[in-house]
Interface confidence: low
């Protein structure tokens, strides 16, 4: 005697989030009479997905008309798939009765949802660092499925190799997250540099997602200081110049000290940018030589970006 078979031809089906999934099921016999039901999972905790007999299943549509007596196609279409729909679906034939009795189950079809990773978010260090130091950048992306994913780091188009990546969770899940930390050695020329985190995933059709961070947010380029004296003017005044060069960011306070006493304090603002993104600033101080008996010790004191002050001193000779 030919036995009823419930055939689920596909062992697995992969669908992109937002699309519809078709789960195929064929019953090889019209007898015994009884409904077909679809479940996700097995055992007492299984979830009813669709029943010919009863219930309201707004996202599930039978592919063929189940009211047709000779219908043996019990395939269903689930619309607007989300990662939460992932799992193994079973097509189950029941014999009509009070209550209906489970007769036969198909082998199951595993539905995997291809969910795109979220746009990678790159975050840099909390505090700035200077050239030659290594800083860490973290890239995070969430909500993707399947688990296989490729992450690369670039600095100005050049691939980086010093990074560590984790995909969580380690076991099976409806969706996954990736977190990667790259170590980047800063150079003085990095004000205009960018780090890019590039995530490639089957859902992206070869068009990877990128997250960027500007190294300008992470770098501090300390200034060079040079104090020079211009020639004495006819009115016995000497012009002393403090050149502060190649610094970044712009936040800088300059204080002139005459023999240890504060003479003037200035704040840098609206400076033009150098080619490499750094800034230069020049401050002048006029010293009235005739008002002094002894040599005048001038100090240019620069406090850059909240760092300890850097001094450069210069002695203005007062001839007897």
């Amino acid at each position: 005697e030919e036995e009823l078979q419930v055939i689920q031809p596909e062992k697995s089906v992969s669908v992109a989030a937002g699309e519809s999934a078709t789960l195929n099921c064929t019953a090889t016999s019209l007898i015994p009479v009884g409904p077909i039901q679809w479940f996700r999972g097995v055992g007492p905790g299984r979830e009813l997905i669709y029943s010919q007999k009863e219930g309201h299943f707004p996202r599930v549509t039978p592919v063929s008309d189940p009211t047709k007596r000779n219908n043996m196609d019990f395939s269903i279409r689930i619309s607007n798939i989300t990662p939460a729909d992932a799992g193994t679906y079973y097509c189950v034939k029941f014999r009509k009765g009070s209550p209906d009795v489970e007769l036969k189950s198909g082998a199951g079809t595993e539905l995997s949802v291809r969910a795109k990773p979220s746009a990678p978010v790159v975050s840099g260090p909390a505090v700035r660092a200077t050239a030659e130091h290594t800083v860490s950048f973290t890239c995070e992306s969430h909500g993707f499925s399947p688990r296989d994913i490729t992450l690369k780091w670039f600095k100005n188009g050049n691939e980086l190799s010093d990074f560590q990546t984790n995909v969580d969770p380690a076991g099976k899940s409806v969706s996954y997250s990736i977190r990667s930390t790259a170590r980047v050695v800063l150079t003085r020329r990095d004000v205009h540099s960018q780090v890019i985190c590039e995530v490639a995933h089957v859902t992206l059709q070869g068009d990877p997602l990128r997250g960027t961070a500007n190294l300008s947010e992470a770098i501090r380029v300390p200034p060079f200081l040079e104090v020079t004296q211009q020639s004495m003017r006819a009115d016995n005044q000497v012009n002393v110049t403090c050149q502060v060069t190649k610094f970044y960011p712009q936040r800088l306070q300059l204080t002139w000290l005459e023999n240890g006493n504060v003479s003037r304090t200035e704040m840098a603002s609206a400076l033009p940018e150098n080619k490499d993104g750094t800034y230069n600033w020049t401050s002048w101080l006029l010293v009235n030589v005739s008002a002094h008996r002894d040599d005048v010790k001038l100090t240019c004191q620069v406090e850059h970006d909240g760092q300890p002050a850097v001094n450069k001193s210069f002695s203005v000779k007062v001839s007897a």
């Epitope: 188009g157 960027t212 033009p272 940018e273």
Partner: antibody, heavy 121, light 107 residues
Framework: QVQLQESGPGLVKPSQTLSLTCTVS??????????WEWIRQHPGKGLEWIGY???????YYNPSLKSRVTISVDTSKNQFSLKLSSVTAADTAVYYC?????????????WGQGTLVTVSS | DIQLTQSPSSLSASVGDRVTITCQAS??????LNWYQQKPGKAPKLLIY???NLETGVPSRFSGSGSGTDFTFTISSLQPEDIATYYC?????????FGGGTKVEIK
Amino acid sequence: QVQLQESGPGLVKPSQTLSLTCTVSGGSISSGEYYWEWIRQHPGKGLEWIGYIYSSGFTYYNPSLKSRVTISVDTSKNQFSLKLSSVTAADTAVYYCAREGLDGSYGSSAWGQGTLVTVSS
Amino acid sequence: DIQLTQSPSSLSASVGDRVTITCQASQDISNYLNWYQQKPGKAPKLLIYDASNLETGVPSRFSGSGSGTDFTFTISSLQPEDIATYYCQQFAYLPYTFGGGTKVEIK
């Protein structure tokens, strides 16, 4: 030896967007060695620097044009592009693309031959 | 923006003459200055970079000097093929700017 070639329409109507592409051959645009820039020259006049792009995507635009300019790069095609929106007759010029070195020679040592764009209805 | 004032705006000299063009910056630009030659209908050509360095392949009769705000471009012995407009360009500050140009003609 690197060569640059501008391409795009020679006539643009006022208020429309001027779009030009510069194709680079004989060198990789994704090399971190250069800035890729656009410069224009109004008829019979001097040169005006428009802006540049770095392989990382970093851009800098001349503030006088900033609100209207977009420079982008397509490393897969070895091209970079200029878009200038809301054009007027004052944007009629020869537009040059050029390559500027980051190390060694800082000058724009390689230029396209230039393309004349006329803004007229 | 940095202003570059080139002078003269045009000059006429004889073959073999020494020709000098000056470029004055509105503020200190160190040696971040280039000199270009542009012949009619052609793209500019880099001659001098960093104020005084001769670009590869450029004849030695061309030279540049200066630093800070005052720069000089010299053709030691003018040749017929030197008929062109010459531009200085600063790259010390963004945006880059060019001088107004000097048109060199032969008497």
